[in-house]
Interface confidence: medium
């Protein structure tokens, strides 16, 4: 709405930067063929680009990225009983963003 | 994976808490009759709620939210030149979060 | 305060039959798995059995299997467990013990404990 | 049935390093958790999940674990840690405990 302006801060850009960010790990990370089973824990955080660039045309990229590899619970629940074991899941971190040009296509004439 | 197991360190939830995000400023929050403007900023950041709980049924919510009005610029092209004028987005950030239990309605029998 | 209290030991002839009891108090006791481990005279910790959040999964040592029953009351915040056919060897100091979530992992928090002679 | 075997008793002079083993056939596919138990008293968690402490516990107190052992160790350690330890894994629908390992603090 255009009311209501004295109240108001002016908003500010959410700069490209890494931000903290919450992944669900799912279950086909760990294993495609079984759905018997669950993952603990089911969330982690991760470090993710994000946020806007002074310029359309333009997006927030990772410039940098790194794996980085946790160990989960697969929980396999067997004649329902609980059965433990040690999974691995990669996550990717971001290191570095940049505000980087989107090549859109031309159309062709 | 269940390979590689030493390099990695055990996942760490991530814990049901206020976490910064990047909010689009779309343009139908400021004028829904007309499409011939930009909004600036795009993109602004707020605080919300986002996370996992220790326990099955709960989810992460927001438990105190607190609306943020804030002051964007509408740039609004008229004549193939821009016109620019102020405009109020309010903004939800979450002050606080819980983890609430979750109704899932029992199947008839 | 978070804590865990046992109560329902005591001297009982072999055969015979007891219910321990575990009252919990201080965090939410159904959102979490729960567990029975003994200790016998001078010996080592030994599981006896667990049960979930909501008592779904229940698992027993084979050495008590077909005897104990373990079993919940989140309303009450008690978890208990239903000994019968009780055998000397079946002497300990009973804990309950709290695991960290609904499906188990560690055994963060543990009661006093409770004393079962099985003694004719 | 699943076993898991410690050492039944460890020394160690005060200040020193104290290393108490677990060992199980592919232990490091499981978590391993470990209790210290003083005389008298209820045991108390010290690690959980293979090295992660629990609020509390002094950062002397670390945890390792892979192949077929899981370690538990003790840096600089002081009278107050003398105490029999226990090591845990859930394996094959069942929680085992270690047979404990008395460890004894000299001086």
């Known amino acids: 709405s255009l009311g209501s302006l004295a109240a108001a801060e002016p908003a500010v850009i959410a700069e490209c930067k890494t931000r903290t960010e919450v992944f669900q790990i799912s279950r086909n990370l760990i294993d495609r063929t079984n759905a018997n089973f669950l993952v603990w824990p089911p969330c982690v955080e991760v470090q993710r680009c994000s946020g806007c660039c002074n310029n359309r045309n333009v997006q927030c990229r990772a410039s940098q990225v790194q794996m980085r590899p946790v160990q989960v619970r697969k929980i396999e629940i067997v004649r329902k009983k609980p059965v433990f074991k040690k999974a691995t899941v990669t996550l990717e971190d971001h290191l570095a963003c940049k505000c980087e040009t989107v090549v859109t296509p031309r159309p062709v004439t | 994976s269940l390979g590689s197991l030493a390099a990695a360190e055990p996942a760490v939830i991530a814990e049901c808490k206020t976490r910064t995000e990047v909010f689009q400023i779309s343009r139908n929050l400021i004028d829904r009759t007309n499409a011939n403007f930009l909004v600036w900023p795009p993109c602004v950041e707020v605080q919300r709620c986002s996370g996992c709980c220790n326990n099955r049924n709960v989810q992460c919510r927001a438990s105190q939210v607190q609306m943020r009005p804030v002051q964007v610029r509408k740039i609004e092209i008229v004549r193939k030149k821009p016109v620019f004028k102020k405009a109020t987005v309010t903004l939800e950030d979450h002050l606080a979060c819980k983890c609430e239990t979750v109704v899932t309605p029992r199947p008839v029998t | 305060e978070v804590q865990l209290l046992e109560s329902g030991g005591g001297l009982v002839q072999p055969g015979g039959s007891l219910r321990l009891s575990c009252a919990a108090s201080?965090?939410?006791?159904?959102?979490?798995?729960m567990s029975w481990v003994r200790q016998a005279p001078g010996k080592g910790l030994e599981w006896v059995s667990y049960?979930?959040?909501?008592?779904?999964?229940?698992y027993y040592a084979d050495s008590v299997k077909g005897r104990f029953t373990i079993s919940r009351d989140n309303s009450k915040n008690t978890l208990y467990l239903q000994m019968n056919s009780l055998r000397a060897e079946d002497t300990a100091v009973y804990y309950c013990?709290?695991?960290?979530?609904?499906?188990?992992?560690?055994?963060?928090?543990w009661g006093q404990g409770t004393l079962v002679t099985v003694s004719s | 049935s699943y076993e898991l075997t410690q050492p039944p008793s460890v020394s160690v002079s005060p200040g020193q390093t104290a290393s108490i083993t677990c060992s199980g056939d592919s232990l490091g596919s499981y978590f391993v958790h470990w209790y210290q138990q003083k005389p008298g008293q209820s045991p108390v968690l010290v690690i959980y999940d293979d090295s992660n402490r629990p609020s509390g516990i002094p950062e002397r107190f670390s945890g390792s674990n892979s192949g077929n052992t899981a370690t538990l160790t003790i840096s600089g350690t002081q009278a107050m840690d003398e105490a029999d330890y226990y090591c845990?894994?859930?394996?094959?629908?069942?929680?085992?405990f270690g047979g404990g390992t008395k460890l004894t603090v000299l001086g």
């Open positions: 013990a709290k695991h960290p979530y609904w499906y188990g992992g560690q055994l963060d928090l």
């Open positions: 845990s894994a859930f394996t094959h629908n069942s929680d085992v």
């Open positions: 049960i979930s959040d909501d008592g779904s999964l229940k």
């Open positions: 201080g965090f939410t006791f159904s959102s979490y798995a």
